[in-house]
Interface confidence: medium
């Protein structure tokens, strides 16, 4: 499988909300030895490898911001201590899973990158990531809303084999 | 603060069984696995399996099958291993860990020591 | 199984040398971890993912690497890093840990 960035940038104003998205593509095995650990982060642009770092977002380490389920099952944060932070990460029936940023400052700017790992039992862990950028701006020159900036088909489709 | 508090020391026969415990605190027992690994003499580690708190999924290294059971409580945030058949080659300290899918142990309990002697 | 060899088994070095040591694969991995371990105590996350530091860990730490072969380096020796190091394979079960690197200070 692989995961793909449908947009590789976000440019928006400060105080706006953002949804920051990723989405599983390929075959997805359903089967009951087969889970799905999907987490965000913030990282930096390595020389060698995008999304290497993992940083934490607004204090919150991917770890706090974790999703886990088995095949294209849905599921949400609920974790009080993501929401007091302004985050919410989600995953939908479709492969589509976000990171939903509210009241957005200067200081959320940079590279954000969502992780899956397909786990099968007894046999091995297999890590896919993508990653994006989320610029926000301040001032005359800030947009009125979220302009999003589509990937382009070599950059969509990120993919780290563990 | 995340800790690990393992059970304390032990001294067994040959033959017997025995189980450790490993209470988790201060993160979210389901969103990691709880390895164990062996350390014999003070040198090689060596790992013995994980469990899922999150559905109670188990891997275990085949060396270490039949030897090791892993359970959890998820009310208490527990780990368990219950080691069967003891032998003198099973005296070791044994670690518990937790680890974040597609990322390492970040966090050790501080370790059982298991004596197996007559 | 994926063994993993480490070399050397014992080294010593002086406060402010440079330090390094490896670790290599029977087979292909796609990432290393490394541990430190001091005696009576518990083993801790050096690095992840290859090169990636672990939280509070000092920057004269790094790692390298890729396929077979890996290695740590400690760039100025201080007395504190005198451990025992050990790699770590997390891509093919079972997981494996090399056979340990004891530093100890001249």
């Known amino acids: 499988f692989k995961v793909a960035t449908p947009y590789s940038l976000y440019v928006c104003p400060e105080g706006q909300n953002v949804t920051l998205t990723c989405r599983l593509l390929g075959p997805v095995d359903k089967g009951h030895d087969v889970t799905f650990y999907k987490t965000w982060y913030r990282s930096s642009r390595g020389e060698v490898q995008t999304c290497s770092e993992r940083r934490p977002i607004r204090n919150l380490t991917f770890q706090d911001l974790h999703l886990h389920h088995g095949g294209h099952q849905a599921a949400n944060t609920s974790h009080d201590l993501a929401q007091r932070h302004g985050l919410e990460s989600a995953s939908d029936h479709h492969g589509n899973f976000s990171i939903t940023m509210r009241n957005l400052t200067l200081l959320d700017s940079g590279l954000y990158c969502c992780l899956v790992v397909e786990i099968r039992h007894h046999h091995s862990e297999h890590r896919v990531h993508g990653a994006m950028e989320l610029q926000v701006q301040t001032g005359k020159d800030a947009p009125s809303n979220c302009v999003v900036y589509p990937s382009s088909s070599q950059d969509s489709e990120n993919i780290t084999a563990a | 603060e995340v800790q690990l508090q393992q059970s304390g020391p032990e001294l067994v026969k040959p033959g017997a069984s025995m189980k450790i415990s490993c209470k988790a605190s201060?993160?979210?027992?389901?969103?990691?696995?709880m390895n164990w690994v062996k350390q014999s003499h003070g040198k090689n580690l060596e790992w013995i399996g994980l469990?899922?708190?999150?559905?109670?999924?188990?891997s275990y290294n085949q060396k270490f099958k039949g030897k090791a059971t892993l359970t959890v409580d998820k009310s208490s945030s527990t780990a368990y291993m219950e080691l069967l058949s003891l032998t003198s080659e099973d005296s070791a300290v044994y670690y518990c860990?937790?680890?974040?899918?597609?990322?390492?142990?970040?966090?050790w309990g501080q370790g059982t020591s298991v004596t197996v002697s007559s | 199984q994926i063994v993993l060899t480490q070399s050397p088994a014992i080294m010593s070095a002086s406060p402010g040398e440079k330090v390094t040591m490896t670790c290599s694969a029977s087979?292909?991995?796609?990432?290393m971890f490394w541990y430190q371990q001091k005696p009576g105590s518990s083993p801790r996350l050096l690095i992840y993912d290859t090169s990636n530091l672990a939280s509070g860990v000092p920057l004269r730490f790094s790692g390298s690497g890729s396929g077979t072969s890996y290695s740590l380096t400690i760039s100025r020796m201080e007395a504190e890093d005198a451990a025992t190091y050990y790699c770590q394979q997390w891509s093919s079960y079972p997981f494996t840990f090399g056979s340990g690197t004891k530093l100890e200070i001249k």
């Open positions: 087979s292909s991995v796609s990432y």
């Open positions: 860990a937790r680890r974040a899918y597609g990322y390492a142990m970040d966090y």
């Open positions: 201060g993160f979210s027992f389901t969103g990691y696995t």
């Open positions: 469990i899922s708190p999150y559905n109670g999924g188990t």
